[in-house]
Interface confidence: medium
């Protein structure tokens, strides 16, 4: 064996955003014929020597960063990319609004504003059907998400979450959906 074994992938099914009380499975996927899998939760360090972790009822304590690796013979693989498992529904939902309007002419700009009943300093925006979140607004203006030169691809249903940077894996419930309509197509 020359060099470390390639890293496995770690995924949460059905999603890494898990409402409190719901179930989730973390699955580590390496090459065929692995001798041993190790799935770890970081801070505090806990691990299971298997390729999956079933969480039947999501609790606050389950939220956090996870990674996995595997062993073949005496060789350990590189660790997987870390997976952030988020508990949602920990706090009341924020409200999501569009400025100047949720009907936006193509090529113009719109700002989606997420407002929390708490003094949270972190907000994140998701579009239905997209795999990832829109940019975290520390680069922007707290709860404002500017979307520039809008196109038809930005039409759709958005939700936001709020949380505190001191507890980054404990999120609010999702906002009510906001439907963004791109006009003039």
């Amino acid at each position: 064996q020359s060099g470390p074994l390639p890293k496995p992938s770690l995924q949460a099914q059905p999603s890494s955003l898990v409402p409190l009380g719901q179930s989730v499975i973390l699955r580590c996927q390496g090459p065929p014929d692995v001798d041993l899998y190790r799935l770890e939760k970081l801070k505090p360090e806990k691990y299971e020597d298997q390729d999956f972790l079933f969480i039947p009822t999501m609790e606050r304590s389950n939220a956090g960063r996870y990674r996995c690796s595997y062993q073949n013979g005496s060789h350990w693989s590189l660790p997987s990319d870390q997976l952030e498992l988020i508990a949602t529904g920990v706090y009341a939902k924020p409200s999501l609004s569009a400025h100047p309007s949720s009907a936006v002419p193509q090529g113009r700009d719109v700002t989606l504003k997420c407002q929390s009943p708490y003094s949270f300093d972190e907000f994140v925006l998701y579009k239905e059907g997209d795999t990832g979140s829109y940019k975290r607004p520390e680069k922007w203006y707290r709860a404002n998400f500017p979307i520039i030169t809008v196109t038809a691809a930005h039409s759709g249903t958005y939700r936001c979450y709020s949380f505190s940077s001191s507890s980054p894996y404990l999120w609010s419930a999702p906002s009510d959906p906001l439907v963004l309509v791109v006009t003039g197509l």
């Epitope: 193509q106 090529g107 829109y134 940019k135 680069k139 500017p146 979307i147």
Partner: antibody, heavy 123, light 110 residues
């Protein structure tokens, strides 16, 4: 890899018409805004405007409105910049550039540039 | 449409640091985090060096960094190298599909 290939240099007389091109490869041409940028000899960069090839929606900077026309043919991944009547003051290097994005969201900068088309207008 | 204000030229010795300023208004630099920087060598097309004030595209050296305060953005080149000699342009989004560029700064490596 992602590339924008522009048409070759042009020498024209005042009053003539001209259409220069910018052919994209290596990405989904229809899904990114394309900008046209002018650079007059020894001067800085000026945004002329942008076009969305998906439906040829064009947006012109105020000082270029009515002076030029943008178009796009998504079947051949090509954007065009056109003049109906050239002036000596149109002498410049013209660049096409792609507005970059992360995921679905534009980040307000031009991440891929063509090599430029030099247009010389002289009697 | 007024350009953003940059110093026309700056110079420094190899290994030194140079910081280029780019001053606009609350309608452009101050109003958006969509400030970008481009490097242009003579006879070449511009190349994106930083976007969203301080983010480097892949392949750009970490010697290039950016920041913004109020209506002024800055590009810092640390550990200056001969190949950094070029013109540098800042740009800011100004809303509704329009951008403005700075007048450019010629950086000379002594």
């Amino acid at each position: 890899q992602v590339q924008l290939q522009q048409s070759g240099a042009e020498v024209k007389k005042p009053g003539e018409s001209l259409k220069i091109s910018c052919q994209a490869s290596g990405y989904s041409f229809s899904s990114y805004w394309i900008a046209w940028v002018r650079q007059m000899p020894g001067k800085g960069l000026e945004l002329m405007g942008i076009i969305y090839p998906g439906d040829s929606d064009a947006r012109y900077s105020p000082s270029f409105q009515g002076q030029v026309t943008f178009s796009a043919d998504k079947s051949i991944n090509t954007a065009y910049l056109q003049w109906s009547s050239l002036k000596a003051s149109d002498t410049a290097m013209y660049y096409c550039a792609r507005q970059g994005k992360t995921g679905s969201y534009y980040f307000g900068a031009f991440d891929v540039w063509g090599q430029g088309t030099m247009v010389t207008v002289s009697s | 449409q007024s350009v953003l204000t940059q110093p026309p030229s700056m110079s420094a010795a190899p290994g030194q640091k140079v910081t280029i300023s780019c001053t606009g208004t609350s309608s452009d630099v101050g109003g958006y985090n969509y400030v970008s920087w481009y490097q242009q060598h003579p006879g070449k097309a511009p190349k994106l060096m930083l976007f969203e004030v301080s983010h480097r595209p892949s392949g750009v050296s970490n010697r290039f960094s950016g920041s913004k305060s109020d209506n002024t953005a800055s590009l810092t080149i640390s550990g200056l190298q001969a190949e950094d000699e070029a013109d540098y342009y800042c740009s800011s989004y100004t809303g509704s599909s329009t951008w403005v560029f700075g007048g450019g700064t010629k950086v000379t490596v002594l």
